[in-house]
């Protein structure tokens, strides 16, 4: 058993039919003596007398909030969570496998630019009784300081016959130069808990990994005289990290008609414009990549040919 | 300790040309081994990042660009001296601190050019003759280090009497070409900064 | 003990709006592992869920009604209480208040209360 | 909505016999799932939660089984004071949705 937060604690259990459970000793906060009893989750069923109540976790039904009265007096209480182990392995319940980049993935997290601001995003089924909370660290051992805010429901989407929660946070490591050649990983802790249920999941990587530049922006067209050709020019995108000189990237520029049968043409560039065939109802797209080190592409930024 | 925005001479920089070679050759090489080797911790989260220059040279510091040097978090200045000639050093106008900067990478290059040579030298003795480093990678790295054209003593080659580990040989082999990748990314931003500035 | 007693008018016309009172006792509402849900069961038919309020004051609906739901508390008088808007004939039914713990059952309930609404 | 199927919609049992209700649930809502017993012109009691948990007080003949989709409610021996209506409910996800409910009555 250990202690989460103030007043809330965590019973580890292996999961598994007729197991022992654990045995956990709750004492009163309180410099009472006599008089005490507990009752679990405000029942009026009083379990036991004393300072001290000892219980044996085995289920769900065990757990709760376990509080201790004098006299109709409420001295202190104790919420008692289950974090599950089946076959070794923690409970991922909570949480959906969002398979990307491989099996296994329950946060993923991306970082427009290397000032070390990032944003981690996970999804459930589960709309209600959910709580999380979200710590990070670069490097584990000894940590530095990484700032995350308050997860927040970030998107609601209907996945066939299932609703499913997008959730996110925002964190900024506390003291990050952009240019810095990193060797520890940032990681990324999330506690959930539904109902009594507690499970935690993580997530390490370092930013050069999850860099996803915004799209260029200003997409702009100038048609060539008697040509069937344009110059599309674009620009960096504004949370991009400076000077672009030193962070610069490379750009995919892409026409496309207006069925995704026909052919695309692409041309790579490391300028911020290029001249290109514009085919009549089709449409031109730009997207940006570190030019030298290869992370994600960012969406694509696009323009009508008309 | 940042570079100064010079107005170089057109033409200045031989050095960018070969950096982005440099950078083209490491990551073949770590694709390259990533799959040949891919029973072995190979890939950036199974490895320990070490950083053979550490405490050595100081490039991230001594190549900052300008504009970063109003950061405190990448004003961890460690004091390194290096020699200070070049031919990447076309114009008089390049300073002190531009001149400390492409040493710092000479140093780098030079350190890496010893370890991928020694390792090499294990690796051709090992039985499977599972991987050997990319000849083009090593000669690179000679070219960029000819650019830079800094006057420095020879390192000469680590030798072992001892029988090699090659499985530790081949996890150190992926150590250093993840180190390398990421040194060549930096080298390349900076070659691409000066050749703006 | 807990107990929980719904209030509010026998007969509502249509149209009109519905305010319907759960007072409560034996546990409160400002402790952060209870809740007060509205369920609602028509003659002869099944229970149907319609609001929830928990102790820090955040609320849900059954998107159905949602439109024409509010559910608010007084922790103070240990009240919760739930207005209807738009009542219609098919909205005659037993209306109860139950208490939902961190259990996430619903483990107390009111004896309920019958609306009928009618012209 | 995750809708709660019950089945079957009534039940006749003897005395002393035992009764097997089956709730399912259109979605996977994990053990989040509750029991209730409703007598004529009373409010429902609570028998099981997560599932499979007796309430305080529920005697042992009443057990609860399953998790995801499919769930059991199982009376061993029934009572004379068994007999009532047995509603399902998740509260996986809001909105929270009790079956149609199973009548078991004396045969």
């Known amino acids: 058993i250990w202690e989460l937060k103030k007043d809330v604690y965590v019973v580890e259990l292996d999961w598994y039919p007729d197991a022992p459970g654990e045995m956990v000793v709750l004492t009163c906060d309180t410099p009472e003596e006599d008089g005490i009893t507990w009752t679990l989750d405000q029942s009026s069923e009083v379990l036991g007398s004393g300072k001290t109540l000892t219980i044996q976790v085995k289920e769900f039904g065990d757990a709760g909030q376990y509080t201790c009265h004098k006299g109709g007096e409420v001295l202190s209480h104790s919420l008692l969570l289950l974090h599950k182990k089946e076959d070794g392995i923690w409970s991922t319940d909570i949480l959906k496998d969002q398979k990307e980049p491989k099996n296994k993935t329950f946060l993923r997290c991306e970082a427009k630019n290397y000032s070390g601001r990032f944003t981690c995003w996970w999804l459930t089924t589960i709309s209600t009784d959910l709580t999380f909370s979200v710590k990070s660290s670069r490097g584990s051992s000894d940590p530095q300081g990484v700032t995350c805010g308050a997860a927040t429901l970030s998107a609601e989407r209907v996945r066939g016959d299932n609703k499913e929660y997008e959730y996110s946070v925002e964190c900024q490591e506390d003291s990050a130069c952009p240019a810095a050649e990193e060797s520890l990983p940032i990681e990324v802790m999330v506690d959930a808990v539904h109902k009594l249920k507690y499970e935690n999941y993580t997530s390490s990587f370092f930013i050069r990994d999850i860099i996803k530049p915004d799209p260029p922006k200003n997409l702009q067209l100038k048609p060539l005289k008697n040509s069937r050709q344009v110059e599309v020019s674009w620009e960096y995108p504004d949370t991009w990290s400076t000077p672009h000189s030193y962070f610069s990237l490379t750009f995919c520029v892409q026409v496309q008609g207006k069925s995704k049968r026909e052919k695309k043409d692409r041309v790579f560039t490391d300028k911020t414009s290029a001249t290109v065939i514009c085919r009549k109802n089709a449409s031109i797209s730009v997207r940006a990549q570190d030019r030298y080190y290869s992370s994600s592409w960012s969406e694509w930024a696009s323009v009508p040919c008309s | 300790r940042n570079l100064p925005v010079a107005t170089p001479d057109p033409g200045m920089f031989p050095c960018l040309h070969h950096s982005q070679n440099l950078l083209r050759a490491v990551s073949n090489m770590l694709q390259k081994a990533r799959q040949t080797l891919e029973f072995y911790p190979c890939t950036s989260e199974e490895i320990d990042h070490e950083d053979i220059t550490k405490d050595k040279t100081s490039t991230v510091e001594a190549c900052l660009p300008l504009e970063l040097t109003k950061n405190e978090s990448c004003l961890n200045s460690r004091e390194t001296s290096f020699i200070t000639n070049g031919s990447c050093l076309a114009s008089r106008k390049t300073s002190f601190m531009m001149a400390l900067c492409l040493s710092s990478i000479y140093e780098d290059l030079k350190m890496y050019q010893v370890e991928f040579k020694t390792m090499n030298a294990k690796l051709l003795m090992d039985p499977k003759r599972q991987i050997f480093l990319d000849q083009n990678m090593l000669a690179v790295i000679d070219e960029l280090m000819q650019a830079l054209n800094f006057n420095s003593e020879t390192v000469p080659q680590k030798s072992s009497l001892e029988e090699p580990d090659f499985y530790k040989t081949k996890i150190k082999l992926c150590i250093l070409l993840h180190a390398f990748r990421i040194r060549a990314v930096t080298i390349d931003r900076v070659m691409s900064y000066l050749n703006a500035s | 003990e807990v107990t929980l007693r719904e209030s509010g008018p026998a007969l509502v016309k249509p149209t009109q709006t519905l305010t319907l009172t759960c007072t409560f006792s034996?546990?409160?509402?400002?402790?952060?592992?209870?809740?007060v849900s509205w369920i609602r069961q028509p003659p002869g038919k099944a229970l149907e869920w319609l609001a929830h309020?928990?102790?820090?004051?955040?609320?849900y609906y059954n998107p159905s009604l949602k439109s024409r739901l509010t559910i608010s508390k007084d922790t103070s008088k240990n009240q919760v209480v739930l207005t209807m808007t738009n009542m219609d004939p098919v909205d005659t039914a037993t209306y109860y208040c139950?208490?939902?713990?961190?259990?996430?059952?619903?483990?107390?309930w009111g004896q309920g209360t019958t609306v009928t609404v009618s012209s | 909505e995750i809708v709660m199927t019950q089945s079957p919609a009534t039940l006749s049992v003897s005395p002393g016999e035992r009764a097997t209700l089956s709730c399912k649930a259109s979605?996977?809502?994990?053990?989040?799932v509750a029991w209730y017993q409703q007598k004529p012109g009373q409010a429902p009691r609570l028998l099981i939660y997560?599932?499979?948990n007796r309430y305080t007080g529920i005697p042992a003949r009443f057990s609860g089984s399953g998790s995801g989709t499919e769930f059991t409610l199982t009376i061993s021996s029934l009572q004379s004071e068994d007999f009532a209506v047995y509603y399902c409910?998740?509260?996986?996800?809001?909105?929270?949705?009790f079956g149609g409910g199973t009548k078991v009555e004396i045969k």
């Open positions: 139950a208490r939902r713990g961190i259990r996430s059952a619903m483990d107390y």
């Open positions: 034996g546990f409160s509402l400002s402790k952060s592992v209870m809740g």
């Open positions: 997560y599932a499979s």
């Open positions: 309020i928990y102790w820090d004051d955040d609320k």
């Open positions: 979605q996977s809502v994990s053990n989040d």
């Open positions: 409910q998740q509260d996986y996800n809001s909105p929270w949705t």
